[in-house]
Interface confidence: medium
Amino acid sequence: EAYKSEIAHRYNDLGEEHFRGLVLVAFSQYLQQCPFEDHVKLAKEVTEFAKACAAEESGANCDKSLHTLFGDKLCTVASLRDKYGDMADCCEKQEPDRNECFLAHKDDNPGFPPLVAPEPDALCAAFQDNEQLFLGKYLYEIARRHPYFYAPELLYYAQQYKGVFAECCQAADKAACLGPKIEALREKVLLSSAKERFKCASLQKFGDRAFKAWSVARLSQRFPKADFAEISKVVTDLTKVHKECCHGDLLECADDRADLAKYMCENQDSISTKLKECCDKPVLEKSQCLAEVERDELPGDLPSLAADFVEDKEVCKNYQEAKDVFLGTFLYEYARRHPEYSVSLLLRLAKEYEATLEKCCATDDPPTCYAKVLDEFKPLVDEPQNLVKTNCELFEKLGEYGFQNALLVRYTKKAPQVSTPTLVEVSRKLGKVGTKCCKKPESERMSCAEDFLSVVLNRLCVLHEKTPVSERVTKCCSESLVNRRPCFSGLEVDETYVPKEFNAETFTFHADLCTLPEAEKQVKKQTALVELLKHKPKATDEQLKTVMGDFGAFVEKCCAAENKEGCFSEEGPKLVAAAQAALV
């Protein structure tokens, strides 16, 4: 349906509050360096304009596209050239090239300091003084740090954030109430950001087909009672939603997401028995609830997969008539029967099935050729199962910090050219898979672990793409989305790496280390570990263990000393000399 004014249409559909929030998020994701006040002003102006267009659709400029309106507004920012350099050149382009240019300048690693919360009384005073501004600042700070954050979901988290403050600012001990709640929300937000970045990468690097296949597998697992046409319908709509959000079209994305939630709730009977509770909620909570809804029970009467995909005499005919649909039904049927498999594994199986049919349907006797295709899946299934088992055993033995260090060593040896901060960040996140997944029952472990690893490895790929330094990382990142994790797992030590020159400055520590929160202390130690490995890539696990043990003791000793700084400057060089000797 064509509207006279697109901006009025979205304003009317979304309502003023959500509209303003989404505009603020959009601007913050594009112009990540601008101060909050500038974005508030821009968002206010756009919202006022939209309001005017909603009242009079034939008003001046109301018929312009959203990209034109938003782009024109962004290009009025006076400091564009100073703050963003060549991004200012985008403003000389016409739509749609201008928007593509803005998108290309989104920075996945803007390097802002981590958000540090002021003390609770000050926070509560700010919240109570101007709730709207307070929540706007939250949207802005998250959006500029995560330029691909799923905007409608960010509105939901802002609502949760508001709920936390509404509750905790009334509490006797505000800090005790806020601390754990804000931390739990922070964890969810970081995971949400990484998941959406993975979806955007799937769409941008591997296209709609890859994203749709991923979604068919995921939704078939979650809604095994729905038929293939129903799954396809939801996947088609979901693909549109994520394409819009990943492309910066946040108003359309949020509007279409609400429409999809409405559709799912109106058609619960043909989708899942688990949607009822979600469907009674307001729009933001409803969409979030549907996205997280538990798996429906499997229908009891599922026939064997072999009947349709191996034993049927028409397999090659059905495949050749419409390859994508036939493979789609295979993926759907396999996924709904295997909720315990990771999506990545299911996609690998579908790929293997496709390769077998391509090969067999060209032979004189296809049925004999593909007769054992389902048995040939075994090694593909065993590989992630064994990987999860081995790594969970290691995690249980070492704990999260020790497991992170083991991964840090593993990944630094695989790709020593990658920057130290990236190796530390990615290995720390990879290590969290243990905490997140290893305590789950056997039937949920693989799905949890491998799909989480895919999301974390995507972060490595995104950061590496910005400054490519390792051909093998580029290869693993770009060859196949579903084989990224096996590709990284399969990398051995990079024998071509020339060790880094020793730099004493890298191993010089100061008393400020003692006052850092535990997580930041760990990062400092892990940074030293990576630098050590880059200097001595042939170091054995035993040697590293000894050196890291000595390092821990040194930090503990100096932090307990009366003259901390003196201790660091005196003992530090001794430690470095001992470490160098130990690693010869």
């Epitope: 038929d227 293939f228 046409a229 129903e230 396809s232 319908k233 088609t236 559709y263 058609n267 009977d269 043909s270 229908p299 599922l302 349709d308 059905n318 649909v325 036939f326 039904t329 049927e333």
Partner: nanobody, 119 residues
Framework: EVQLLESGGGLVQPGGSLRLSCAAS????????MLWVRQAPGKGLEWVSV????????YYADSVKGRFTISRDNSKNTLYLQMNSLRAEDTAVYYC????????????WGQGTLVTVSS
């Protein structure tokens, strides 16, 4: 009882067009995905196109992609197939069918309508 009644077939020259219709009754049409299948003389059944209950998405066999368009009018309980740029190999009996609960097969189909493409 499920009933599907196809119409609109006939003789047409190569490059010509036809529009097939299928009137449905005996089940809730607006909650059922539907498809067109065809059977050429002496050949097996071949599926042509699928449409979701809401009208999107739609799927087509590779052999008809870009030439055929499936659509539906839920208020009239009717399924359509617009066939353009017809070729001799499109000659077949066309059946409309109700999409099943699971596999890419079909539960019920009508008596069919014959489409002959010949000069």
């Amino acid at each position: 009882e499920v009933q599907l009644l196809e119409s609109g077939g006939g003789l047409v020259q190569p490059g010509g067009s036809l529009r097939l219709s299928c009137a449905a009754s005996g089940f809730t049409f607006d909650t059922s995905s539907m498809l067109w299948v065809r059977q050429a003389p002496g050949k097996g059944l071949e599926w042509v196109s699928v449409i979701h209950q809401s009208g999107t998405p739609t799927y087509y066999a590779d052999s008809v992609k870009g030439r055929f368009t499936i659509s539906r009018d839920n208020s009239k309980n009717t399924l359509y197939l617009q066939m353009n740029s017809l070729r001799a190999e499109d000659t077949a009996v066309y059946y409309c069918a109700k999409f099943p609960s699971s596999r890419m097969k079909f539960d019920y189909w009508g008596q069919g309508t014959l489409v002959t493409v010949s000069s």
